[in-house]
Amino acid sequence: GSVPPMVNVTRSEASEGNITVTCRASSFYPRNITLTWRQDGVSLSHDTQQWGDVLPDGNGTYQTWVATRICQGEEQRFTCYMEHSGNHSTHPVPSGNSHHHHHHHH
C-alpha cells in the first residue's frame, strides 16, 4: 500500500529583503512524488526552484525537498504543492519565527 508524506515548510533569511522557503516531504511510499512551489496557485518555473533527490530514509519510505527564494512580505502568495499516489495538498509558508508546520496528508 501507499504511505502518505509528512510535509513540512520552513523559512530562513537569505539576503536583504529575501527569504528561502523549503518544503520537505518525508516518510512516503512509493517514491513517486510531485513537489513544487507555486505563486498565486501557478507552479514556479523550473529554473527558480532547487530540488533534492528522492532518497530512502531508512524505514522503507522516502524523503525529498524543494526550495525557492522569495521576497519578504510576499509569503502569502506562495504555497508548496504536493501530489502523491493520487492525493494532493497545499502548504503555506509559516509566518516569521514560527515553529515548523507539519502536515500528514491522508
Epitope: 498565486d40 496557485g41 501557478v42 507552479s43 518555473s45 502568495r77
Partner: antibody, heavy 116, light 107 residues
Framework: VQLQESGPGLVKPSQSLSLTCNVT?????????WNWIRQFPGNKLEWIGY???????TYNPSLKSRVSITRDTSKNQFFLQLNSVTPEDTATYYC??????????WGLGTSVTVSS | DIQMTQTPSSLSASLGDRVTISCRAN??????LNWYQQKPDGAVKLLIY???RIHSGVPSRFSGSGSGTDYSLTIANLEQEDVATYFC?????????FGGGTKVEIK
C-alpha cells in the same frame, strides 16, 4: 467550474475596453490564478495577465502599461480593463483558471472589435 | 519572450489514423508544456499538461511527450470529434506563450 465572459462587442479607438468574467463552481479566493487571454484574427493567442486568489496581479510586460485586472469577491467575478485601445486590440477575449501548470478551465470567449 | 513553433500548421488525416503534432521552443522549457484543443465554435479545453499528464476526462487516445525544447502531441486513433485546432503553451518562463496552432481536418 464554469467561466463566462461578457462585455461590449464594439469599442472606439482610444477608449477603454472593459470585460467581466463570471465564475461559478469555484471561489476565486480559494486558490489558483484567474487569467485573461486573447486570440487575434488568424488564431494567435496572447496571455494578458492574471489576478491570483490573494488578489495579487501579474501582467504580460508587453501590455502592463495599459492593463488592469481587478475582482469582486462578493460576486465571484474578475475584470479586465485595457486602456487606449487601437484596432490591433480587436480579438476574442477569454478568461481562464490557471491551476498549477496549466489553464484547466476556459470561458467560451467574447469577441471585441475596436473601430470608430 | 520564449517563441513556440508548432508544425504542421494544418493537416488532413483519415479516421483511425495516428496523428502527431510538434512544438519547439527556442530554449529549454523543462517539461512545462501544455496542449489545448480549440473546437470550431471557439471552445478551448486542456488536453495534456506538464508534457505528458492527461487532464481529467480527456480520452486516452491523446498523449504527450518530449523534453528540453522539443515536444509532441499524439492522437492514436483519429475520431471525427477531434476536428479542431491544437495549441501548445509553455509555462516555464514568464510571460507564458503559445504556439501558432495546428488545424486538424478529416480527409
Amino acid at each position: 467550474v464554469q467561466l463566462q465572459e461578457s462585455g461590449p462587442g464594439l469599442v472606439k479607438p482610444s477608449q477603454s475596453l472593459s470585460l467581466t468574467c463570471n465564475v461559478t463552481g469555484y471561489s476565486i479566493t480559494g486558490d489558483y490564478a484567474w487569467n485573461w487571454i486573447r486570440q487575434f484574427p488568424g488564431n494567435k493567442l496572447e496571455w494578458i495577465g492574471y489576478i491570483g486568489y490573494t488578489g495579487s496581479t501579474t501582467y504580460n510586460p508587453s501590455l502592463k502599461s495599459r492593463v488592469s485586472i481587478t475582482r469582486d469577491t462578493s460576486k465571484n467575478q474578475f475584470f479586465l480593463q485595457l486602456n487606449s485601445v487601437t484596432p490591433e486590440d480587436t480579438a476574442t477575449y477569454y478568461c481562464a483558471r490557471w491551476r498549477n501548470w496549466a489553464m484547466d478551465y476556459w470561458g467560451l470567449g467574447t469577441s471585441v472589435t475596436v473601430s470608430s | 519572450d520564449i517563441q513556440m513553433t508548432q508544425t504542421p500548421s494544418s493537416l488532413s488525416a483519415s479516421l483511425g489514423d495516428r496523428v502527431t503534432i510538434s512544438c519547439r521552443a527556442n530554449q529549454d522549457i523543462s517539461h512545462y508544456l501544455n496542449w489545448y484543443q480549440q473546437k470550431p465554435d471557439g471552445a478551448v479545453k486542456l488536453l495534456i499538461y506538464y508534457t505528458s499528464r492527461i487532464h481529467s476526462g480527456v480520452p486516452s487516445r491523446f498523449s504527450g511527450s518530449g523534453s528540453g525544447t522539443d515536444y509532441s502531441l499524439t492522437i492514436a486513433n483519429l475520431e471525427q470529434e477531434d476536428v479542431a485546432t491544437y495549441f501548445c503553451q509553455q509555462g516555464n518562463t514568464p510571460p507564458t506563450t503559445f504556439g501558432g496552432g495546428t488545424k486538424v481536418e478529416i480527409k
